[in-house]
């Protein structure tokens, strides 16, 4: 049975040209995290493997930096970066937990962070 929950930075906004940290945290489970994948739609942004470290997809290498921790830093933001981002926690023995973050990149200088909130939804991948 999967008992864990993923807490994320939730709905966030940032200014065009700036940077933002995407962060997820898995709690309430003793499952071992073997890998965390960061994704945007059908694009794989990065993989953080517990043994092997970080792999940033070549398409994103100039604008994505690993960390802090298991998080991901997006740099030189454009309006096209607006959208859903997912952290996929591959764990043993639980399976897969998914967290969702919505990022809005704003033209103006009025950009605020949304509140952190918990995502109760998770699914188990066999």
């Amino acid at each position: 049975m999967m008992t864990g929950t993923i807490e994320t930075t939730g709905n966030i906004s940032a200014e065009k040209g700036g940077s933002i940290i995407l962060q997820c945290h898995l709690s309430s489970t003793t499952a071992q995290v073997t890998q965390v994948n960061w994704e945007q739609q059908d694009q794989l942004l990065a993989i953080c493997n517990a043994d092997l470290g970080w792999h940033i997809s070549p398409s994103f290498k100039d604008r994505v930096a690993p960390g802090p921790g298991l998080g991901l830093t997006l740099q030189s933001l454009t309006v096209n970066d607006t959208g859903e981002y997912f952290c996929i926690y591959h764990t043993y023995p639980d399976g897969t937990y998914t967290g969702r973050i919505f990022l809005e990149v704003l033209e103006s200088s009025v950009a605020e962070h949304g509140a952190r909130f918990q995502i109760p939804h998770h699914h188990h991948h066999h």
Epitope: Q43, L52, S59, H90
Partner: antibody, heavy 120, light 107 residues
Framework: EVQLQESGPGLVKPSETLSLTCAVS????????WNWIRQPPGKKLEWIGY???????YYNPSLKSRVTISRDTSKNQFSLKLSSVTAADTAVYYC??????????????WGQGTTVTVSS | DIVMTQSPDSLAVSLGERATINCKAS??????VAWYQQKPGQSPKLMIY???YRYTGVPDRFSGSGSGTDFTLTISSLQAEDVAVYYC?????????FGGGTKVEIK
């Protein structure tokens, strides 16, 4: 240039332990990930597992109970042990390097492979 | 485990013609796919990583495309030295898995 060379017996008896070594030259095994991959005759390539730059190991769950990958940093080599072998373990065994940072799980350097037959 | 299914099993193409190899993943692997070339009696060689990026020294007649579950390796103009078996591999999650291979021959 990175070079990998497998060595070990070509014939192993059923129920015994298969032991192979991979000697690495041109690169230190304290960087990157060092893998064993096999190819049974007429079948898919099968990833067996790796030992990381730090010495951590990960094994394919289908073989986990029988596999041990270890390393000897002083000799710059790593080894595979597969216990309780059967005819299904007959395959060409490759050692390989994986530069995870640059290429993810794509294997960029392979040994030439060594054929292991399990037979009495 | 994620199953990678290649088609066709074999392919005969005239010299200078286009060869297209398909690979289907049993679940969404985004762009975490590599392609390898294995010539008779040799070990596999990395050709494409991250679905569409050519590895160092790979001729530009080789290209990869796709994301999600469907991927393609294309040889735009087949040369005699391209005769080989080609394998796809996913590295979206462990255990990393390979396709069954596609044999490319000259017609």
């Amino acid at each position: 240039e990175v070079q990998l060379q497998e060595s070990g017996p070509g014939l192993v008896k059923p129920s015994e332990t298969l032991s192979l070594t991979c000697a690495v030259s041109g690169y230190s095994i304290t960087s990157d990930s060092w893998n064993w991959i096999r190819q049974p005759p007429g079948k898919k390539l099968e990833w067996i597992g790796y030992i990381s730059y730090s010495g951590n190991t990960y094994y394919n769950p289908s073989l986990k109970s029988r596999v041990t990958i270890s390393r000897d940093t002083s000799k710059n080599q790593f080894s595979l042990k597969l216990s309780s072998v059967t005819a299904a373990d007959t395959a060409v065994y490759y050692c390989a390097r994986l530069d995870f940072s640059n290429y993810g799980g794509a294997v960029d350097y392979w040994g030439q492979g060594t054929t292991v037959t399990v037979s009495s | 485990d994620i199953v990678m299914t290649q088609s066709p099993d074999s392919l005969a193409v005239s010299l200078g013609e286009r060869a297209t190899i398909n690979c289907k993943a049993s679940q969404n692997v985004r762009t975490a796919v590599a392609w390898y070339q294995q010539k008779p009696g040799q070990s596999p060689k990395l050709m494409i990583y991250s679905a569409s990026y050519r590895y160092t020294g790979v001729p530009d007649r080789f290209s990869g495309s796709g994301s999600g579950t469907d991927f393609t390796l294309t040889i735009s103009s087949l040369q005699a030295e391209d005769v080989a078996v080609y394998y796809c591999q996913q590295y979206y999650t462990t255990p990393w898995t390979f396709g069954g291979g596609t044999k490319v021959e000259i017609k």
